[in-house]
Interface confidence: low
Protein backbone atom coordinates (compact mmCIF):
# COMPACT_ATOMS: atom_id res chain seq x y z
CA UNK A 1 0.00 0.00 0.00
CA UNK A 2 1.04 3.59 -0.47
CA UNK A 3 1.97 5.45 2.70
CA UNK A 4 0.10 8.73 3.10
CA UNK A 5 2.39 11.73 3.50
CA UNK A 6 1.98 13.76 6.66
CA UNK A 7 0.49 17.19 6.03
CA UNK A 8 1.64 18.38 9.42
CA UNK A 9 3.75 21.53 9.45
CA UNK A 10 7.29 20.39 10.39
CA UNK A 11 7.62 23.52 12.51
CA UNK A 12 4.89 22.30 14.84
CA UNK A 13 7.39 19.83 16.30
CA UNK A 14 9.66 22.62 17.55
CA UNK A 15 9.17 22.97 21.31
CA UNK A 16 9.16 26.13 23.40
CA UNK A 17 12.69 27.46 23.72
CA UNK A 18 13.42 26.81 20.06
CA UNK A 19 12.45 28.24 16.70
CA UNK A 20 11.89 26.71 13.30
CA UNK A 21 14.95 27.80 11.33
CA UNK A 22 14.00 28.38 7.69
CA UNK A 23 17.66 28.95 6.84
CA UNK A 24 18.53 25.43 8.03
CA UNK A 25 15.82 23.38 6.34
CA UNK A 26 13.30 24.04 9.14
CA UNK A 27 15.45 22.48 11.83
CA UNK A 28 14.49 23.35 15.41
CA UNK A 29 17.24 25.67 16.61
CA UNK A 30 17.64 26.88 20.20
CA UNK A 31 16.69 30.48 20.83
CA UNK A 32 19.78 32.70 20.71
CA UNK A 33 20.97 34.41 23.90
CA UNK A 34 18.62 37.15 25.17
CA UNK A 35 15.62 35.71 23.34
CA UNK A 36 12.86 33.23 24.11
CA UNK A 37 9.86 31.39 22.70
CA UNK A 38 7.17 30.49 25.20
CA UNK A 39 5.16 28.30 22.83
CA UNK A 40 6.03 25.58 20.37
CA UNK A 41 6.02 25.93 16.61
CA UNK A 42 7.46 29.45 16.51
CA UNK A 43 9.41 30.68 13.49
CA UNK A 44 11.24 33.31 15.53
CA UNK A 45 12.28 33.89 19.10
CA UNK A 46 11.30 37.12 20.80
CA UNK A 47 13.82 39.50 22.34
CA UNK A 48 13.85 39.33 26.13
CA UNK A 49 12.53 42.32 28.00
CA UNK A 50 15.37 44.31 29.56
CA UNK A 51 15.01 45.71 33.05
CA UNK A 52 17.12 48.85 32.83
CA UNK A 53 17.59 52.03 34.78
CA UNK A 54 14.91 52.39 37.42
CA UNK A 55 13.64 48.90 36.54
CA UNK A 56 15.24 45.83 38.07
CA UNK A 57 14.87 42.18 37.18
CA UNK A 58 12.25 40.32 39.17
CA UNK A 59 12.49 37.18 37.03
CA UNK A 60 15.31 36.41 34.64
CA UNK A 61 14.56 35.66 31.02
CA UNK A 62 14.84 32.01 30.08
CA UNK A 63 14.68 30.33 26.70
CA UNK A 64 10.96 29.71 27.31
CA UNK A 65 9.75 32.78 29.22
CA UNK A 66 10.28 36.52 29.14
CA UNK A 67 11.91 38.48 31.92
CA UNK A 68 9.70 40.28 34.42
CA UNK A 69 10.65 43.65 35.89
CA UNK A 70 9.80 45.56 39.01
CA UNK A 71 11.19 48.82 40.37
CA UNK A 72 14.32 49.73 42.29
CA UNK A 73 13.94 50.72 45.96
CA UNK A 74 12.26 54.09 46.31
CA UNK A 75 9.96 53.43 43.34
CA UNK A 76 6.88 51.31 42.75
CA UNK A 77 5.24 49.85 39.64
CA UNK A 78 2.42 51.61 37.84
CA UNK A 79 0.39 50.43 34.91
CA UNK A 80 -0.40 47.11 33.32
CA UNK A 81 2.71 44.94 33.30
CA UNK A 82 4.64 47.49 35.39
CA UNK A 83 4.82 49.91 32.47
CA UNK A 84 6.55 52.54 34.57
CA UNK A 85 8.14 53.15 37.94
CA UNK A 86 6.77 55.96 40.09
CA UNK A 87 8.61 57.56 42.98
CA UNK A 88 7.62 56.43 46.48
CA UNK A 89 6.60 59.03 49.05
CA UNK A 90 6.56 58.73 52.83
CA UNK A 91 3.47 57.72 54.74
CA UNK A 92 1.46 60.90 55.27
CA UNK A 93 2.32 62.19 51.81
CA UNK A 94 1.11 61.89 48.22
CA UNK A 95 2.92 62.35 44.91
CA UNK A 96 2.01 65.51 43.01
CA UNK A 97 3.42 67.19 39.90
CA UNK A 98 5.83 69.00 42.21
CA UNK A 99 6.97 65.91 44.10
CA UNK A 100 5.90 64.46 47.44
CA UNK A 101 3.59 66.70 49.46
CA UNK A 102 2.18 66.23 52.95
CA UNK A 103 -1.46 65.21 53.21
CA UNK A 104 -3.81 68.13 53.86
CA UNK A 105 -5.48 68.31 57.26
CA UNK A 106 -8.38 65.86 57.39
CA UNK A 107 -6.72 63.38 55.04
CA UNK A 108 -4.23 60.56 55.47
CA UNK A 109 -2.11 58.07 53.53
CA UNK A 110 -0.82 55.01 55.36
CA UNK A 111 1.25 53.82 52.37
CA UNK A 112 4.24 54.95 50.30
CA UNK A 113 2.09 55.23 47.19
CA UNK A 114 -1.35 56.44 46.22
CA UNK A 115 -3.26 59.51 47.29
CA UNK A 116 -4.28 61.05 50.59
CA UNK A 117 -7.81 59.98 51.55
CA UNK A 118 -10.28 61.69 53.89
CA UNK A 119 -10.53 60.53 57.47
CA UNK A 120 -13.54 58.36 58.22
CA UNK A 121 -16.54 60.40 59.36
CA UNK A 122 -17.46 58.49 62.50
CA UNK A 123 -20.68 60.42 63.01
CA UNK A 124 -22.13 59.01 59.78
CA UNK A 125 -22.24 55.64 61.53
CA UNK A 126 -23.53 57.17 64.75
CA UNK A 127 -20.16 56.70 66.40
CA UNK A 128 -17.65 59.01 68.03
CA UNK A 129 -13.94 59.54 67.41
CA UNK A 130 -11.98 57.30 69.76
CA UNK A 131 -8.52 58.11 68.37
CA UNK A 132 -7.83 61.23 66.33
CA UNK A 133 -6.56 60.90 62.78
CA UNK A 134 -3.12 61.96 61.62
CA UNK A 135 -1.49 62.43 58.22
CA UNK A 136 -0.44 58.76 58.40
CA UNK A 137 -3.45 57.16 60.06
CA UNK A 138 -7.24 57.23 59.81
CA UNK A 139 -9.33 58.07 62.83
CA UNK A 140 -10.46 55.21 65.03
CA UNK A 141 -14.20 55.24 65.60
CA UNK A 142 -15.56 54.16 68.93
CA UNK A 143 -19.03 53.51 70.26
CA UNK A 144 -21.51 56.34 70.36
CA UNK A 145 -21.91 58.07 73.75
CA UNK A 146 -25.21 56.29 74.21
CA UNK A 147 -23.43 52.93 73.97
CA UNK A 148 -21.07 53.73 76.82
CA UNK A 149 -23.37 52.22 79.44
CA UNK A 150 -22.02 49.64 81.91
CA UNK A 151 -21.32 46.31 80.22
CA UNK A 152 -21.07 47.76 76.74
CA UNK A 153 -18.16 46.77 74.52
CA UNK A 154 -15.41 49.38 74.78
CA UNK A 155 -13.82 49.60 71.31
CA UNK A 156 -14.97 48.74 67.82
CA UNK A 157 -11.90 48.01 65.67
CA UNK A 158 -11.73 50.10 62.48
CA UNK A 159 -12.39 48.49 59.14
CA UNK A 160 -9.15 47.76 57.24
CA UNK A 161 -8.22 50.52 54.81
CA UNK A 162 -8.52 49.63 51.15
CA UNK A 163 -5.40 50.09 49.06
CA UNK A 164 -5.92 52.92 46.59
CA UNK A 165 -5.45 52.41 42.89
CA UNK A 166 -6.61 49.78 40.46
CA UNK A 167 -6.81 46.13 41.36
CA UNK A 168 -7.19 43.32 38.82
CA UNK A 169 -10.76 42.38 38.10
Amino acid sequence: FERTRSLQDPCSNCPAGTFCDNNRNQICSPCPPNSFSSAGGQRTCDICRQCKGVFRTRKECSSTSNAECDCTPGFHCLGAGCSMCEQDCKQGQELTKKGCKDCCFGTFNDQKRGICRPWTNCSLDGKSVLVNGTKERDVVCGPSPADLSPGASSVTPPAPAREPGHSPQ
Partner: antibody, heavy 125, light 108 residues
Amino acid sequence: EVQLVESGGGLVQPGGSLRLSCVASGFTFSSYEMNWVRQAPGKGLEWVSYISNSGTTIYYAGSVKGRFTISRDNAKKSLYLHMNSLRAEDTAVYYCAREGTIFGTVHYYFALDVWGQGTTVTVSS
Amino acid sequence: DIQMTQSPSSLSASVGDRVTITCRASQSISSYLNWYQQKPGKAPKLLIYAASSLQSGVPSRFSGSGSGTDFTLTISSLQPEDFATYYCQQSYSTPPITFGQGTRLEIK
Protein backbone atom coordinates in the same frame (compact mmCIF):
# COMPACT_ATOMS: atom_id res chain seq x y z
CA GLU B 1 3.19 38.90 8.37
CA VAL B 2 2.10 40.07 11.81
CA GLN B 3 -1.68 39.99 11.84
CA LEU B 4 -4.77 40.03 14.08
CA VAL B 5 -8.14 38.93 12.70
CA GLU B 6 -11.36 39.47 14.64
CA SER B 7 -14.66 37.65 14.19
CA GLY B 8 -17.92 37.05 16.01
CA GLY B 9 -19.65 40.39 15.57
CA GLY B 10 -23.26 40.69 14.49
CA LEU B 11 -26.72 41.96 15.33
CA VAL B 12 -28.01 41.14 18.79
CA GLN B 13 -30.99 42.27 20.85
CA PRO B 14 -30.55 44.29 24.05
CA GLY B 15 -29.80 41.92 26.91
CA GLY B 16 -28.27 39.39 24.55
CA SER B 17 -24.78 37.92 24.38
CA LEU B 18 -21.94 37.60 21.87
CA ARG B 19 -18.45 36.19 21.88
CA LEU B 20 -15.79 37.97 19.86
CA SER B 21 -12.60 36.17 18.81
CA CYS B 22 -9.24 37.49 17.67
CA VAL B 23 -6.71 35.14 16.08
CA ALA B 24 -3.06 36.15 15.95
CA SER B 25 -0.43 35.13 13.43
CA GLY B 26 3.13 36.07 12.59
CA PHE B 27 4.32 36.62 16.16
CA THR B 28 4.63 34.80 19.48
CA PHE B 29 1.15 35.55 20.80
CA SER B 30 1.87 34.24 24.30
CA SER B 31 4.56 36.89 24.79
CA TYR B 32 2.25 39.86 24.37
CA GLU B 33 -0.30 41.67 26.48
CA MET B 34 -3.54 42.25 24.56
CA ASN B 35 -6.40 44.74 24.60
CA TRP B 36 -9.86 45.25 23.19
CA VAL B 37 -10.70 48.76 21.98
CA ARG B 38 -14.05 49.83 20.52
CA GLN B 39 -15.35 52.66 18.38
CA ALA B 40 -19.03 53.63 18.32
CA PRO B 41 -20.37 54.92 14.98
CA GLY B 42 -18.94 58.37 14.29
CA LYS B 43 -17.17 58.46 17.66
CA GLY B 44 -13.63 58.13 18.97
CA LEU B 45 -11.66 55.20 20.35
CA GLU B 46 -12.60 53.73 23.74
CA TRP B 47 -10.47 51.18 25.57
CA VAL B 48 -12.52 48.18 26.75
CA SER B 49 -10.30 45.56 28.37
CA TYR B 50 -6.74 44.34 28.94
CA ILE B 51 -5.24 40.89 29.58
CA SER B 52 -1.63 40.07 30.44
CA ASN B 53 0.34 37.62 28.35
CA SER B 54 -0.24 34.78 30.82
CA GLY B 55 -3.89 35.73 31.37
CA THR B 56 -3.44 36.24 35.10
CA THR B 57 -3.99 40.01 35.15
CA ILE B 58 -7.18 41.48 33.70
CA TYR B 59 -8.65 44.98 33.63
CA TYR B 60 -11.96 46.38 32.35
CA ALA B 61 -13.35 49.80 31.57
CA GLY B 62 -16.01 50.87 34.05
CA SER B 63 -18.65 50.88 31.32
CA VAL B 64 -18.33 47.11 30.72
CA LYS B 65 -17.23 45.80 34.12
CA GLY B 66 -19.41 42.91 35.27
CA ARG B 67 -20.84 42.36 31.79
CA PHE B 68 -17.80 41.59 29.61
CA THR B 69 -15.16 38.93 30.16
CA ILE B 70 -11.77 38.88 28.42
CA SER B 71 -9.83 35.65 28.06
CA ARG B 72 -7.13 34.12 25.92
CA ASP B 73 -5.94 30.71 24.74
CA ASN B 74 -2.24 30.95 24.01
CA ALA B 75 -2.13 27.48 22.47
CA LYS B 76 -4.69 28.63 19.89
CA LYS B 77 -3.14 32.10 19.60
CA SER B 78 -6.58 33.48 20.32
CA LEU B 79 -8.06 36.34 22.32
CA TYR B 80 -11.74 36.43 23.29
CA LEU B 81 -14.31 38.89 24.55
CA HIS B 82 -17.49 37.43 26.03
CA MET B 83 -20.16 40.12 26.08
CA ASN B 84 -23.31 39.68 28.17
CA SER B 85 -26.26 41.94 29.00
CA LEU B 86 -25.57 43.95 25.88
CA ARG B 87 -26.93 47.48 25.60
CA ALA B 88 -27.55 49.83 22.70
CA GLU B 89 -24.51 51.86 23.77
CA ASP B 90 -22.28 48.82 23.21
CA THR B 91 -22.90 49.17 19.46
CA ALA B 92 -19.44 49.69 17.96
CA VAL B 93 -16.63 48.28 15.90
CA TYR B 94 -14.49 46.18 18.24
CA TYR B 95 -10.75 45.96 17.65
CA CYS B 96 -8.23 43.67 19.27
CA ALA B 97 -4.84 45.31 19.66
CA ARG B 98 -1.42 44.06 20.63
CA GLU B 99 0.45 45.93 23.33
CA GLY B 100 4.00 46.36 22.09
CA THR B 101 6.83 47.29 24.42
CA ILE B 102 9.57 49.77 23.59
CA PHE B 103 12.59 49.95 25.84
CA GLY B 104 14.09 53.21 27.00
CA THR B 105 17.14 53.69 29.17
CA VAL B 106 15.12 54.39 32.31
CA HIS B 107 11.50 53.60 31.55
CA TYR B 108 9.94 51.36 29.02
CA TYR B 109 6.99 52.45 26.98
CA PHE B 110 4.07 50.61 25.49
CA ALA B 111 1.83 51.32 22.55
CA LEU B 112 -0.87 49.47 20.65
CA ASP B 113 1.34 48.56 17.74
CA VAL B 114 -0.75 45.96 15.90
CA TRP B 115 -4.52 46.18 15.39
CA GLY B 116 -7.08 43.84 13.85
CA GLN B 117 -9.43 44.99 11.11
CA GLY B 118 -12.34 45.17 13.55
CA THR B 119 -15.65 43.36 13.90
CA THR B 120 -19.00 45.18 14.11
CA VAL B 121 -21.41 44.62 16.99
CA THR B 122 -24.90 46.09 16.65
CA VAL B 123 -27.24 45.99 19.64
CA SER B 124 -30.77 46.79 18.56
CA SER B 125 -34.29 45.48 18.93
CA ASP C 1 -8.32 58.63 35.23
CA ILE C 2 -6.11 60.77 33.03
CA GLN C 3 -8.11 62.78 30.47
CA MET C 4 -6.67 63.59 27.05
CA THR C 5 -7.92 66.63 25.10
CA GLN C 6 -7.05 67.22 21.46
CA SER C 7 -7.31 70.43 19.49
CA PRO C 8 -8.60 71.27 17.06
CA SER C 9 -11.41 68.74 16.67
CA SER C 10 -11.16 69.16 12.91
CA LEU C 11 -9.10 71.16 10.47
CA SER C 12 -8.90 71.72 6.74
CA ALA C 13 -5.57 71.91 4.95
CA SER C 14 -4.06 71.56 1.50
CA VAL C 15 -1.46 69.19 0.09
CA GLY C 16 1.97 70.56 0.95
CA ASP C 17 0.81 72.40 4.08
CA ARG C 18 2.50 72.08 7.45
CA VAL C 19 -0.04 70.92 10.03
CA THR C 20 0.14 70.76 13.83
CA ILE C 21 -2.27 68.91 16.12
CA THR C 22 -2.06 69.34 19.87
CA CYS C 23 -2.90 67.01 22.74
CA ARG C 24 -3.13 67.99 26.40
CA ALA C 25 -3.15 65.60 29.36
CA SER C 26 -5.05 66.36 32.57
CA GLN C 27 -1.87 65.64 34.54
CA SER C 28 1.79 65.19 33.76
CA ILE C 29 2.41 62.01 31.77
CA SER C 30 6.13 62.52 31.14
CA SER C 31 6.65 61.28 27.57
CA TYR C 32 4.17 58.39 27.77
CA LEU C 33 2.18 59.58 24.76
CA ASN C 34 1.38 57.78 21.50
CA TRP C 35 -0.17 59.03 18.24
CA TYR C 36 -2.37 57.00 15.89
CA GLN C 37 -3.75 57.60 12.41
CA GLN C 38 -7.12 56.19 11.36
CA LYS C 39 -8.58 56.26 7.86
CA PRO C 40 -12.32 55.73 7.27
CA GLY C 41 -13.33 52.08 7.59
CA LYS C 42 -9.84 51.05 8.70
CA ALA C 43 -8.17 50.20 12.01
CA PRO C 44 -5.96 52.75 13.74
CA LYS C 45 -2.25 52.66 12.92
CA LEU C 46 0.54 53.56 15.34
CA LEU C 47 2.53 56.57 14.11
CA ILE C 48 4.57 57.80 17.08
CA TYR C 49 5.33 56.32 20.50
CA ALA C 50 7.02 57.81 23.57
CA ALA C 51 5.98 61.32 22.39
CA SER C 52 8.62 61.64 19.68
CA SER C 53 9.78 58.23 18.42
CA LEU C 54 8.67 57.35 14.90
CA GLN C 55 7.19 53.87 14.49
CA SER C 56 8.95 51.72 11.92
CA GLY C 57 7.68 52.33 8.38
CA VAL C 58 6.10 55.72 9.14
CA PRO C 59 7.23 58.54 6.81
CA SER C 60 9.64 61.08 8.30
CA ARG C 61 7.27 63.97 7.55
CA PHE C 62 5.48 62.93 10.75
CA SER C 63 7.04 64.09 13.99
CA GLY C 64 6.02 64.37 17.62
CA SER C 65 7.17 66.54 20.46
CA GLY C 66 6.29 67.52 24.00
CA SER C 67 6.57 66.24 27.55
CA GLY C 68 4.54 66.59 30.72
CA THR C 69 1.06 67.75 29.74
CA ASP C 70 1.41 69.34 26.28
CA PHE C 71 2.20 67.43 23.10
CA THR C 72 2.12 68.09 19.36
CA LEU C 73 1.95 65.99 16.23
CA THR C 74 3.37 67.76 13.18
CA ILE C 75 3.07 66.81 9.52
CA SER C 76 5.73 68.84 7.73
CA SER C 77 4.27 68.60 4.22
CA LEU C 78 0.81 67.11 3.83
CA GLN C 79 0.39 64.32 1.32
CA PRO C 80 -2.97 63.14 -0.10
CA GLU C 81 -2.79 59.92 1.95
CA ASP C 82 -2.44 61.88 5.22
CA PHE C 83 -6.06 63.03 5.30
CA ALA C 84 -7.45 60.98 8.18
CA THR C 85 -8.36 61.19 11.87
CA TYR C 86 -5.54 61.37 14.40
CA TYR C 87 -5.71 60.25 18.03
CA CYS C 88 -3.35 60.71 20.96
CA GLN C 89 -3.22 58.13 23.75
CA GLN C 90 -1.52 58.10 27.14
CA SER C 91 0.27 55.04 28.47
CA TYR C 92 1.55 56.67 31.66
CA SER C 93 -0.99 55.32 34.12
CA THR C 94 -3.07 52.37 33.07
CA PRO C 95 -5.68 51.07 33.31
CA PRO C 96 -7.48 52.65 31.72
CA ILE C 97 -5.71 53.42 28.48
CA THR C 98 -7.20 56.76 27.48
CA PHE C 99 -7.41 58.39 24.06
CA GLY C 100 -8.02 61.94 22.94
CA GLN C 101 -11.31 62.57 21.18
CA GLY C 102 -9.63 62.71 17.78
CA THR C 103 -8.72 65.37 15.22
CA ARG C 104 -10.20 65.03 11.76
CA LEU C 105 -7.87 66.33 9.04
CA GLU C 106 -9.79 67.21 5.86
CA ILE C 107 -8.82 68.45 2.41
CA LYS C 108 -9.39 72.18 1.97
